[in-house]
Interface confidence: medium
């Protein structure tokens, strides 16, 4: 796995622990929480992400704080179980044995259950609006502006091939990011856009997961875009299933 | 004058399949957040299928895999393919239409008068 | 059954004001999501009257108004009138449905 080799860190993952034990003296670096070995030449999946958060201290974990919306299931945070892979596994349970199924953002999407709970594949999150209200400006950005520099974020920070971004729109002070990725498209080796927007949404909030580098810069023609309110609606392959008891609860 | 008429409202039976249309005038298809919103006797409204501007579609839970939303561009309109129907799945049928702006605000402001699917056993 | 919830029916004199509420929760309004209250009269199909929590399309007069609070949101209309008779809606999206939600509707009955 790549990472810089002169102090052996992970440039797109700070909460990973690197030495130089890989094959030949490389820098290898593994992240908290599950000790898994990760790509430092692409950014770590959300299921790594959100074990390593839970397994920072406490007082540390303020320093890492989920914004508002990150995780968009009403039970907060929790300590997800990932597959080999680092993605999500369907089926996450607690330490009191009540289960559920997820996506592949990890949100649920099911009714609480308990060990005998089946999910049997982990469906895709295929379709990501990221609806963002920026601060009051002198005027407003100009459009063709900010779709070409929010495309070329995603594409320089995050990664993620500009087929993905599907439509960036803006209606002061309004922007929306679509972000598609069916499983049919996903190449091995394309960033996830789940994984892109949780990054993106980080930075947003001033909680960057990159190594050492300054917070998000976001600047259009260098005007500062600031933000003040980030919403996420998640469209998955298959609809989630509730029963009728979760919606009168 | 933006306007949404739909058609194609049937008495059908358990298990059958209809097409719904929502025939579009005074603005295109191709650039709106076009929606299914059902509503059964005397109950309230429960939202069924959108299609976006991109062509992408999503369906309710309750529908998927049963019902199919489409858009035709060259004729305008808007359909929702309605197979394996049940009891339940009787209803007044709208389509409706967000605001125009290019972004998705969740909202539906532009309705048609409705078509009713009469499913019985 | 609703995921938003609504008070089945609400009534008022003529040039009263009356509210309707619609209570949600933190995967609804509760998480910030915008509000949308619709008028259904009699035989017809709803009309959009509040979008966006607090913003009245054109045409609506500005005895409709819109807040929301927490996970709650709430449509007030004043000096009523007879015509104001109708079922009015609520709706958000959901976050842990994934979809486009609406409460189970009041009946509103001007005195």
């Known amino acids: 796995h790549t990472a810089a080799q002169d102090n052996c860190t992970c440039p797109t993952n700070k909460m990973t622990v690197c030495s130089p034990d890989g094959p030949g003296g490389r820098c290898q670096c593994r992240a908290l929480g599950s000790g898994m070995a990760v790509d430092c030449s692409t950014l770590t999946s959300k299921c790594l992400l959100l074990k390593a958060r839970m397994s920072a201290p406490k007082n540390a974990r303020t320093l890492v704080r989920p914004s508002e919306h990150a995780l968009v299931d009403n039970d907060g945070l929790y300590d997800p179980d990932c597959d080999p892979e680092g993605r999500f596994k369907a089926r996450q349970c607690n330490q009191t044995s009540v289960c559920w199924c997820v996506n592949s953002v990890g949100v649920r999407r099911t009714d609480k259950g308990d060990l005998s709970l089946r999910c049997d594949e982990l469906v895709r999150t295929h379709h990501i609006l990221i609806d963002l209200r920026h601060r009051p400006t002198a005027g407003a950005f100009n459009h063709s502006d900010l779709d070409a520099e929010l495309r070329r974020l995603f594409r320089e920070r995050y990664r993620l091939h500009p087929k993905f971004v599907a439509a960036v729109h803006y209606e002061q002070p309004t922007i929306q990011i679509e972000l598609r990725q069916n499983t049919s498209q996903k190449a091995a080796g394309d960033v996830d856009i789940g994984d892109a927007a949780y990054y993106f949404e980080r930075d947003i909030k001033g909680e960057s997961l990159f190594q050492g580098r300054g917070g998000l810069d976001l600047r259009v023609r260098g005007e500062p875009l600031q933000v003040e309110r980030t919403l996420i609606y998640y469209l998955d392959e298959i609809p989630p299933k509730f029963s009728m008891k979760r919606l009168t609860a | 004058e933006v306007q949404l008429v739909e058609s194609g409202g049937a008495l059908v039976q358990r298990g059958g399949s209809l097409r719904l249309s929502c025939s579009a005038s005074g603005f295109s298809v191709r650039n709106n957040y076009i929606t299914w919103v059902r509503q059964a006797p005397g109950k309230g409204l429960e939202w069924v299928a959108i299609v976006f501007p991109g062509g992408s579609s999503y369906h309710a839970d309750s529908v998927k895999g049963r019902f199919t939303i489409s858009r035709d561009l060259s004729k305008n309109s808007v359909y929702l393919e309605m197979n394996s129907l049940r009891e339940d799945d009787t209803g007044v049928y709208f389509c409706?239409?967000?605001?125009?702006?290019?972004?998705?605000?969740?909202?539906?402001?532009?309705w048609g008068q409705g078509t009713t699917v009469t499913v019985s056993s | 059954q609703s995921v938003l919830t609504q008070p089945p029916s609400v009534s008022g004199a003529p040039g009263q004001r009356v509210t309707i509420s619609c209570t949600g929760s933190?995967?609804?309004?509760?998480?910030?999501?915008?509000v949308h209250w619709y008028q259904q009269l009699p035989g017809t199909a709803p009309k959009l009257l509040i979008y966006d929590n607090n913003k009245r399309p054109s045409g609506i007069p500005d005895r409709f108004s819109g807040s929301n609070s927490g996970t709650s949101a709430t449509l007030g209309i004043t000096g009523l009138q007879t015509g104001d008779e109708a079922d009015y809606y609520c709706g958000t999206w959901d976050t842990s449905l994934s979809a486009w939600v609406f409460g189970g509707g009041t009946r509103l009955t001007v005195l």
């Open positions: 409706a239409r967000d605001s125009g702006s290019p972004l998705w605000r969740g909202h539906f402001q532009y």
């Open positions: 933190s995967a609804n309004i509760g998480a910030g999501y915008d």
